[in-house]
């Protein structure tokens, strides 16, 4: 029914994650995760971050690891929320009410997000060579990333 996930794994907390290589807009990726019985993944601190990093490092995707890949995650800055340059997530937030770890214990930003308080913005996880997590990158929600991460 579904093309199988490129990689999947679970964390010590019992949550499971899947990584999919598919060129998609953010909305289509989020819908894909829901249709699979999950949701677009948060990548908070601690066990969750470790589980997702392990998925990425399990091997290169299409292209054999020759280029940086962008994966949709459940990170966005809502309209009317401002860029906060001194916050670890820069004013972005995870689309989940699950309790998370310390936001200070997160990946770095590959590029600083544009300063804005008006437009909704999404963010991707950039992986160098498709396997080594470089950090977060702001991305317009209607653009296509190389893949997405789901959480179950």
């Amino acid at each position: 029914e579904h093309p199988t996930a490129d990689r999947a794994g679970c964390s010590a907390s019992g949550a499971c994650y899947s990584l999919h290589h598919a060129t998609m807009k953010r909305q289509a990726a989020e819908e894909a995760c829901i249709l699979r019985g999950g949701a677009l993944s948060t990548v908070r601190a601690g066990a969750e971050l470790r589980a997702v990093l392990a998925l990425l490092r399990a091997g290169p995707g299409p292209g054999g690891g020759s280029k940086d890949l962008l994966f949709w995650v459940a990170l966005e800055r809502r309209r009317s929320h401002c860029t906060l340059e001194n916050e670890p997530l820069r004013g972005f937030s995870w689309l989940s009410s699950d309790p998370g770890g310390l936001e200070s214990d997160t990946l770095q930003w590959v590029e600083e997000p544009q300063r804005s308080c008006t437009a909704r913005r999404c963010a991707v996880l950039q992986a160098t060579g498709g396997v080594e997590p470089a950090g977060w990158k702001e991305m317009r929600c209607h653009l296509r990333a190389n893949g997405y991460l789901c959480k179950y």
Partner: antibody, heavy 117, light 108 residues
Framework: EVQLQQSGTVLARPGASVKMSCKAS????????MHWVKQRPGQGLEWIGA????????SYNQKFKGKAKLTAVTSTSTAYMELSSLTNEDSAVFYC????????????WGQGTSVTV | QIVLTQSPAIMSASLGERVTMTCTAS???????LHWYQQKPGSSPKLWIY???NLASGVPARFSGSGSGTSYSLTISSMEAEDAATYYC?????????FGGGTKLEIK
């Protein structure tokens, strides 16, 4: 303007199969999931499944697995649904529908294809 | 799957009357993924209210939506003749997407 144009009314015998179409225009067909919904006469709405034309990924309501098959042809921006082993329970109006701009609500619908078994 | 129960199944209201119908989910649904559709006989459903409280394009301001968790409602502040229709709630928080059985609103 976004439009979903569905094929016409179908009359079919029990046990037969039917294939209906939904031609999309006014948006990038390969970028959005296309959903199918069933409505029996005088009844409510049931989600059948969805297809992502960009890579032919599909998802089905468990109830319709083995009954419905979803496909898409990107060159013509057309989605198809085939229903097999028809019974009286399959007599209904079938809608193709997709999200385009409001949080995952189905905000564009075809006019419906009526199937009578 | 998440079951959505709408009540009442059928209701009638006089012109100018305030109308409220409810949608109860069998388990919690994010307000972002709870929507309402209006359908009239012989027509396709139309998105009416999305994400619990946002009116779709062209929907009169007399309509409103509210709720959270397992309890949602659609309200018409002052019934008009064109509001006679069947209204369906719909969730997309969990797959499969599900719809309520509908509330048929008639003019008294």
């Amino acid at each position: 303007e976004v439009q979903l144009q569905q094929s016409g009314t179908v009359l079919a015998r029990p046990g037969a199969s039917v294939k209906m179409s939904c031609k999309a225009s006014g948006y990038t067909f390969t970028s959005y999931w296309m959903h199918w919904v069933k409505q029996r006469p005088g009844q409510g709405l049931e989600w059948i499944g969805a297809i992502y034309p960009g890579n032919s990924d599909t998802s089905y309501n468990q109830k319709f697995k083995g009954k419905a098959k979803l496909t898409a042809v990107t060159s013509t921006s057309t989605a198809y649904m085939e229903l097999s082993s028809l019974t009286n329970e399959d007599s209904a109006v079938f809608y193709c529908t997709h999200y385009y701009g409001s949080d995952y609500a189905m905000d564009y619908w075809g006019q419906g294809t009526s199937v009578t078994v | 799957q998440i079951v959505l129960t709408q009540s009442p199944a059928i209701m009638s209201a006089s012109l100018g009357e305030r109308v409220t119908m409810t949608c109860t989910a069998s388990s919690s649904v994010s307000s972002s993924y709870l929507h309402w559709y209006q359908q009239k006989p012989g027509s396709s459903p139309k998105l009416w209210i999305y994400s619990t409280s946002n009116l779709a394009s062209g929907v009169p301001a007399r309509f409103s939506g509210s709720g959270s968790g397992t309890s949602y409602s659609l309200t018409i502040s002052s019934m008009e003749a064109e509001d006679a229709a069947t209204y369906y709630c719909h969730q997309y928080h969990r797959s499969p997407r599900t719809f309520g059985g509908g509330t048929k609103l008639e003019i008294k």
